[in-house]
């Protein structure tokens, strides 16, 4: 194994779970996967004297890297103190150190709610010269928060002087006011309240609504899939118009593009509807450099009896990226369906939401047909997620049992697609270079996460991971609500102690 | 090593039974599919069935020329495999393998018994 | 049943010497096809799977290509030990079948 340096992660406890009275603590500075050995461990107690005690590296199974803890038990007026753990380690470099300064314990919190209100606009619709937004961050514990305002994503240069804080109770309010011009408003760009808070980030976004449509009539325009994107590289947008009754004006839909460049030839499409109504379709081919570098393109319907054109644009989604992570199940025999079993990859903690999932069997790409995939929906943080499941003959997986989920997305590097291999008989599928399995171990902390059901093998544990109080077979003291895991993770021991 | 030897073949009249085994050792028997292919001298390899593993209710196949005659069973417990074969003809007469399929590719076979002689004559 | 046609039904070749022998399909099996080597007097040999993965063991001189209903087996630089009957397995379903066989005779 070549030279890894240590990844570090505090261990301390919640503070509810320590007695008002404890006249001593323990805490704890977890060093994983360096290799190789030794790692130097110090501590700096500041006025306060303390013992410590090193334990025996341990090896990860897999890796063959190594993983110890060093505990510090400390006396006295410790509640205030900040502690320091400072890790060397002398085969990455005779200067590779890191430090992590923490308190004796985690505190429960209330996270804040975020919402942005939007001044009125005049009676007659109309905006008025400036625009404010409020943003109220709203039923936290209180603490310190930062607030900041995005443009498109981009920080904005704002007064936050006049933000103001109150306390009801035991929770607090702040609330942050931002003013633009009318033109700024109007350019269609979106506004975010960014809130930072324990080390956690809270958000609302808003922009102006789409003018209100001529009644009963949509239009829609899609991005180009990341499929069509990064593998066939001939991506195309659409322009959906539903709803329109059929007459003997003809619905125009006129492409462009912001930068005024010309666009390429567009195909349309005219359906009629069960239900008597005309949907109209215009499919533009784009440039994968165009759409990539952000070239905004625009879609305007026009009908002799609409009252206004309606004008519909779409570009790259601005924001940050996050590459998917894939994880790939087989669902275990049922009774009466012995010949068919359940493939399920979940694909999670994406963004920007655009993502295109595919099926593959012994390399080639089962049809579009064969499986069936949610829509990206919001995690609890801030990336999506998808599920798609896919059912397969006994004749298939006995051709050969192993079946490729396949994420596109841009986040994904080096070539825009992650995949995961599942086999219906796992235990029998007898490895294979493709799997990108890590099974390793996964290190937990009690506290929130205490009494969750296990991690399902194959997915990320975090953050449903088990943890008991304390295990026999980890050699730390009990009170530290240390466990360790096998699970199947993206990578060796992960830290998943949210107190 | 993966090992596998047949035994139990012999010279039968025609409308006989005749029970094969095949005894295998270095891999783990449970595991695997297993099947019998057959070769009549100077002829080609005729599959002839194949018995799943626990895991998939060791269940079996046969080609059309020897459903309802010959039956595949397995002893998990002792790593054997054995052909049970019925109403034998003359054309049945060829030497029988024991073959291990693979894994993942459950249809594909890798490694072979040195084969057992059987001659179906009155 | 999927047919398996092989081709040439027998060659001779001379040591050092390359030979390719086809198998052909009567459906599109799309990769699942295996080649196995049997000496004079031995049982089967695994040379390839699912196509062009040379199984354990096999000399890299073997080498196999194909998809669809096309199949062939190039072996390089012809040994001596690689003279007897090469046979093609489809492992796409059930039944499995096998080819009629190549004789592969030093010349």
């Known amino acids: 194994a070549s030279t890894q340096s240590p990844s570090v992660f505090p261990l301390t406890r919640c503070c509810k779970n320590i007695p008002s009275n404890a006249t001593s603590v323990t805490l704890g500075c977890l060093a994983t996967g360096y290799f190789p050995e030794p790692v130097m461990v110090t501590w700096d107690t500041g006025s306060l004297n303390g013992t410590t005690m090193t334990l025996p590296a341990t090896t990860l199974t897999l890796s063959g890297h190594y993983a110890t803890i060093s505990l510090l038990t400390v006396s006295g007026a410790w509640a205030k103190q900040m502690f320091t753990c400072r890790v060397a380690h002398t085969p990455s470099s005779t200067d590779w150190v890191d430090n992590k300064t923490f308190s004796v314990c985690s505190r429960d919190f209330t996270p804040p709610t975020v919402k942005i209100l939007q001044s009125s606009c005049d009676g007659g619709g109309h905006f008025p010269p400036t625009i404010q937004l409020l943003c109220l961050v709203s039923g936290y514990t209180p603490g310190t928060i930062n607030i900041t305002w995005l443009e498109d994503g981009q920080v904005m240069d704002v007064d936050l002087s006049t933000a103001s804080t109150t306390q009801e109770g035991e929770l607090a309010s702040t609330q942050s006011e931002l003013t633009l011009s009318q033109k700024h408003w109007l350019s269609d760009r979106t506004y975010t309240c960014q809130v930072t808070y324990q080390g956690h980030t809270f958000e609302d976004s808003t922009k102006k609504c789409a003018d209100s449509n001529p009644r009963g009539v949509s239009a829609y325009l899609s991005r180009p899939s990341p499929f069509d994107l990064f593998i066939r590289k001939s991506p195309t947008i659409t322009c959906l118009v539903v709803d329109l009754a059929p007459s003997k004006g003809t619905v125009n839909l006129t492409w462009s593009r912001a930068s005024g460049k010309p666009v390429n030839h567009s195909t349309r499409k005219e359906e009629k509807q069960r239900n008597g109504t005309l949907t109209v379709t215009s499919t533009l081919p784009v440039g994968t450099r165009d759409w990539i570098e952000g070239e905004t393109y625009q879609c305007r319907v026009t009908h002799p009896h609409l009252p206004r054109a309606l004008m519909r644009s779409t570009t790259k989604t601005s924001g940050p990226r996050a590459a998917p992570e894939v994880y790939a199940f087989a669902t275990p025999e049922w009774p009466g369906s012995r010949d068919k079993r359940t493939l399920a990859c979940l694909i999670q903690n994406f963004m920007p939401e655009d993502i295109s999932v595919q099926w593959l069997h012994n390399e080639v790409q089962l049809p579009d047909a064969r499986h069936s995939t949610t829509q990206p929906r919001k995690t609890k943080g801030s990336g999506f997620f998808v599920f798609s499941r896919l059912e397969v003959t006994r004749a298939e997986w006995e051709q050969k049992d192993e079946f490729i989920c396949r994420a596109v997305h841009e986040a994904a590097s080096p070539s825009q697609t992650v995949q995961r291999a599942v086999s219906v008989n796992p235990g029998l599928a007898g490895g294979s270079a493709q799997s990108q399995r890590a099974p390793d171990r996964v290190l937990c902390h009690s506290g929130q996460q205490q009494g969750l059901p296990r991690a399902a093998g194959g997915s990320v544990p975090h953050p449903r991971c088990h943890c008991g109080a304390g295990r026999a077979d980890w050699p730390g003291p009990p009170e530290l609500d240390v466990c360790v895991e096998e699970a199947e993770g993206e990578a060796p021991w992960t830290w998943t102690g949210l107190c | 090593e993966v090992k596998l030897v047949e035994s139990g073949g012999e010279l039968v009249q025609p409308g006989e039974s005749l029970r094969l085994s095949c005894s295998t050792s270095?891999?783990?028997?449970?595991?695997?599919?297993m099947s019998w292919v057959r070769q009549p001298p100077g002829k080609a390899l005729e599959w002839l069935g194949f018995i799943r593993n626990k895991a998939n209710s060791y269940t079996t196949e046969y080609s059309t020329s020897v459903k309802g005659r010959f039956y595949i069973s397995r002893d998990d417990s002792q790593n054997i495999l054995y052909l049970q074969m019925n109403t034998l003809r003359p054309e049945d007469g060829a030497t029988y393998y024991c073959?291990?399929?693979?894994?993942?590719?459950?249809?594909?076979?890798?490694?072979w018994g040195q084969g057992t002689s059987v001659t179906v004559s009155s | 049943d999927i047919q398996l046609t092989q081709s040439p039904a027998s060659l001779s070749a001379s040591v050092g010497e390359t030979v390719t022998i086809t198998c052909r399909t009567s459906e599109n099996i799309y990769s699942y096809l295996a080649w196995f080597q049997q000496r004079q007097g031995k049982s089967p040999h695994l040379l390839v799977y699912?196509?062009?993965i040379l199984a354990e063991g096999v000399s890299s001189r073997f080498s196999g290509s194909g998809s669809g209903t096309q199949f062939s087996l190039e072996i390089n630089s012809l040994q001596p030990e690689d003279f007897g009957t090469y046979y093609c397995q489809h492992h796409y379903g059930i039944p499995l079948t096998f080819g009629a066989g190549t004789k592969l005779e030093l010349k």
């Open positions: 073959v291990r399929n693979k894994k993942v590719y459950y249809y594909a076979v890798d490694y």
């Open positions: 270095g891999f783990t028997f449970t595991d695997y599919y």
């Open positions: 699912d196509s062009k």
